[in-house]
Interface confidence: medium
Amino acid sequence: MSVTACQGLGFVVSLIGFAGIIAATCMDQWSTQDLYNNPVTAVFNYQGLWRSCVRESSGFTECRGYFTLLGLPAMLQAVRALMIVGIVLGVIGILVSIFALKCIRIGSMDDSAKAKMTLTSGILFIISGICAIIGVSVFANMLVTNFWMSTANMYSGMGGMGGMVQTVQTRYTFGAALFVGWVAGGLTLIGGVMMCIACRGLTPDDSNFKAVSYHASGQNVAYRPGGFKASTGFGSNTRNKKIYDGGARTEDDEQSHPTKYDYV
């Protein structure tokens, strides 16, 4: 895969992921009422980061915002912060990456500058994706904790739990926004990794200086330093190919093991 293609694909993947992070942040269905024990209910409750909603069996739906930070759990506010930081970093990453795209010429910007901008945007996308994944995971953990606590309360007859609007009768489980957030965070992360890989392809190869003649005793042979490299597969001609082969494997690894970040 060429540098331009990898960079462009990384940008598109990050853009899709970024859009998903915004969508997840705005969605109301971060937690939804668990209907396992009560599949036929007159009211279906679901909650987002910014408001909670009620949908009746008739289809009537109404939402109301969390007007203050007063009774909201610190974890929820932390998740809000992580998602917003992810969005802000994503916006900056997109702006930087637009200028860094190899297919777009801006003034006399050389490949070195574009490489630095590509790396910067890649890092921003990676951090943005990680913020989203952590934010969604923290919320999911909060839900799991509350779910089991409310399950215990059902059988012990205790009162409602704190956290989100948690009552003895109502338990909440994962909403669609969590899955959107996880996928979006992963895509943004992958896109960022691809941008970082593309940066390595954009970096001018300092070892490709002009050929110099070395005069050995009794012989007059010209050596091209890049020649040996090319024959071993490490020359400038095949550098991109080698790195992108590795890049493809990284992407596969990322999809197979979404919790491993040690190679980022």
Partner: antibody
Framework: EVQLLESGGGLVQPGGSLRLSCAAS????????MMWVRQAPGKGLEWVGE????????YYGSAVKGRATISRDNSKNTLYLQMNSLRAEDTAVYYC?????????????????WGQGTLVTVSS | SYELTQPPSVSVSPGQTARITCSGG????YGWYQQKPGQAPVLVIY???QRPSGIPERFSGSSSGTTVTLTISGVQAEDEADYYC?????????FGGGTKLTVL
Amino acid sequence: EVQLLESGGGLVQPGGSLRLSCAASGFTFRSYAMMWVRQAPGKGLEWVGEISSTGGSTYYGSAVKGRATISRDNSKNTLYLQMNSLRAEDTAVYYCAKSTYGATWKSADSIDAWGQGTLVTVSS
Amino acid sequence: SYELTQPPSVSVSPGQTARITCSGGYNGHYGWYQQKPGQAPVLVIYSNNQRPSGIPERFSGSSSGTTVTLTISGVQAEDEADYYCGGYDSSAGIFGGGTKLTVL
């Protein structure tokens, strides 16, 4: 002008039943959740229960749960409260109240209209 | 279960500022009601700090930490009444015990 007029109060024997009505006018009744709130003589306000705008969901306070039923007839712009197994501690002025919302939020934070109340006395 | 806690009484001279607190609620939604003897309650503040039409500007609401406050600036004699805060405890609506505002 929003008007809520309660009726049906009076003296009831312990263990007896009563049905309160609330006639609403001056607003689109079918668009708002409605509540019943009571106040024992010389005491504070107590949330009895709430019904959504469509009548699809109802919630009740712990003191009346299992003994109270709130219903509404949107065609007649009327709210009802049926109370069974009445006790002396149910003696109070019962207010019909309008929420600013359409859904049942189990909340007493946004009641923007109240009736004048009807007194229910449970005594032998 | 949550409880809304209010001071039983607050006394203030005419023209001064009265502050009535309410603490212990849930999820940040509070309303304030004024009730004069023999009358039904009247909503004076909703959503912590919003004033319904027809309510004088001297009534305002604020929140700090886990406490909301009803502030009446330039108290007048007609403001003497019982004031209740309302909210919810995640399973039912609840009211504070009420605060009697006395204008000296």
